[in-house]
Interface confidence: medium
Amino acid sequence: AELFLIASPSHPTEGSPVTLTCKMPFLQSSDAQFQFCFFRDTRALGPGWSSSPKLQIAAMWKEDTGSYWCEAQTMASKVLRSRRSQINVHRVPVADVSLETQPPGGQVMEGDRLVLICSVAMGTGDITFLWYKGAVGLNLQSKTQRSLTAEYEIPSVRESDAEQYYCVAENGYGPSPSGLVSITVRIPVSRPILMLRAPRAQAAVEDVLELHCEALRGSPPILYWFYHEDITLGSRSAPSGGGASFNLSLTEEHSGNYSCEANNGLGAQRSEAVTLNFTVPTGARSNHLTS
């Protein structure tokens, strides 16, 4: 009696199942009681000897490519061996690599977590994923895993993480890059500093006093509000960041506490108060303002 090994499908794709069947065309299963064993190269597969002429392999991988055969043993211990059958497992090259961010849109608050998710639409087997920052040649991280997506995490984002990123995927057919994704790090404003600038060391009534408010950190645009004794004097915008100034023509009523507030939509911060007092220097006829 002749023995045949049939693999279905005969040219499997990585990750897909394969059924091996040990066939005896000229013998009915009722004619004799057989034990079956399947082999790859020199190694027995599955449970070893079994009464089933079929062996189900849940997932085939590139490294499972090889020469397969089966043996059948009768109750009288006669062993039949099939011819070797070559099974080539086909690897699907990676295709359509994309990079996405969590949070979506690539906008993240300083100190928050950022995840760069690299995905491939197609590809089988061990896929190597790499993440790159800007034009720096060395990668941030690389991972090899049997999945279509992989993640690179920045647990606490810093200002220096604001850059363009891309990822690369590869499974033995050469590297494929994703498109570039821009990361914007949103920084809440720091406590602003209020400075008073006068045209001379001791400003007099009718002089123009400049109130300059500046938050040293914070994503633009920043809106600055100016206050005298908690009464709003006005506001100024700094579209590109930096500080802003408010000019005031001095009168005797302008004595008192001044402060400013910076707001960039991520939180507001108020400066310390600066006090202005009118003094009358000895021998002087006009009022002067000191801070």
């Epitope: 040649g137 990668n139 991280q141 690389s142 991972k143 090899t144 050469g174 890059p177």
Partner: antibody, heavy 118, light 107 residues
């Protein structure tokens, strides 16, 4: 400042062995893939071997001409990569550069000269 | 193995000129090409990767272009320090292979 410093080159007879070392500093060595590239007047620049990072299971790749004779290895704790060269041939003569990067070579050492001659 | 052919062993140019160095791959390598500059007695330096991405610190007079099998490194407004050997490299598949190099010389 990035530095790659090769050592271990010299004169060796055909059939002999030699081990090259490369000490790295100034970048995150554990994340980098490390390669050896050699250069000779006859063959120009020739990629020799690569060892990937721990995240890539330290996978190794070799040029066909050195497969079975050369072994690349790394010690991340020492930020060092090595090239063990056995059964050396006259055609293995050249300057051996230690390089770092992924696919393309970003960082290069100054090279160490290996001369295989009777 | 993929063969990278740099057909011009030498190229003559003058300071201030524009020069194009070509490299041809024996099969389609997509955009997986890097370019290196090597000055006499020194190790190579990375200029370009992904066929057209300039490496950090590389002057913008160096431009890479091409995809598939034909690649070009263009140096506009050549400076005296650009006189060196230039090599292309493919990283589409192992083994990585280099071109034989093009030496840029002054006329």
């Amino acid at each position: 400042e990035v530095k790659l410093e090769e050592s271990g080159g010299g004169l060796v007879q055909p059939g002999g062995s030699m081990k090259l070392s490369c000490a790295a500093s100034g970048f995150t060595f554990g994340d980098a893939w490390m390669d050896w590239v050699r250069q000779s007047p006859e063959k120009g620049l020739e990629w020799v071997a690569e060892i990937r990072s721990k995240a890539n299971n330290h996978a190794t790749y070799y040029a066909e001409s050195v497969k079975g004779r050369f072994t690349i290895s790394r010690d991340d704790s020492k930020s060092s990569v090595y090239l063990q060269m056995n059964s050396l041939r006259v055609e293995d003569t050249g300057i051996y550069y230690c390089t770092g990067g992924n696919y393309w070579f970003v960082y290069w050492g100054q090279g160490t000269l290996v001369t295989v001659s009777a | 193995d993929i063969v990278m052919t740099q057909s011009h062993k030498f190229m003559s140019t003058s300071v201030g000129d524009r020069v194009s160095i070509t490299c041809k791959a024996s099969q389609d390598v997509g955009s997986t090409v890097a370019w290196y500059q090597q000055n006499p007695g020194q190790s190579p330096k990375l200029l370009i990767y992904w066929a057209s991405t300039r490496h950090t610190g590389v002057p913008d007079r160096f431009t890479g272009s091409g995809s598939g099998t034909d690649f070009i490194l263009t140096i506009s407004n050549v400076q005296s320090e650009d006189l060196a050997d230039y090599f292309c490299q493919q990283y589409s598949s192992y083994p990585f292979t280099f071109g034989s190099g093009t030496k840029l010389e002054i006329k």
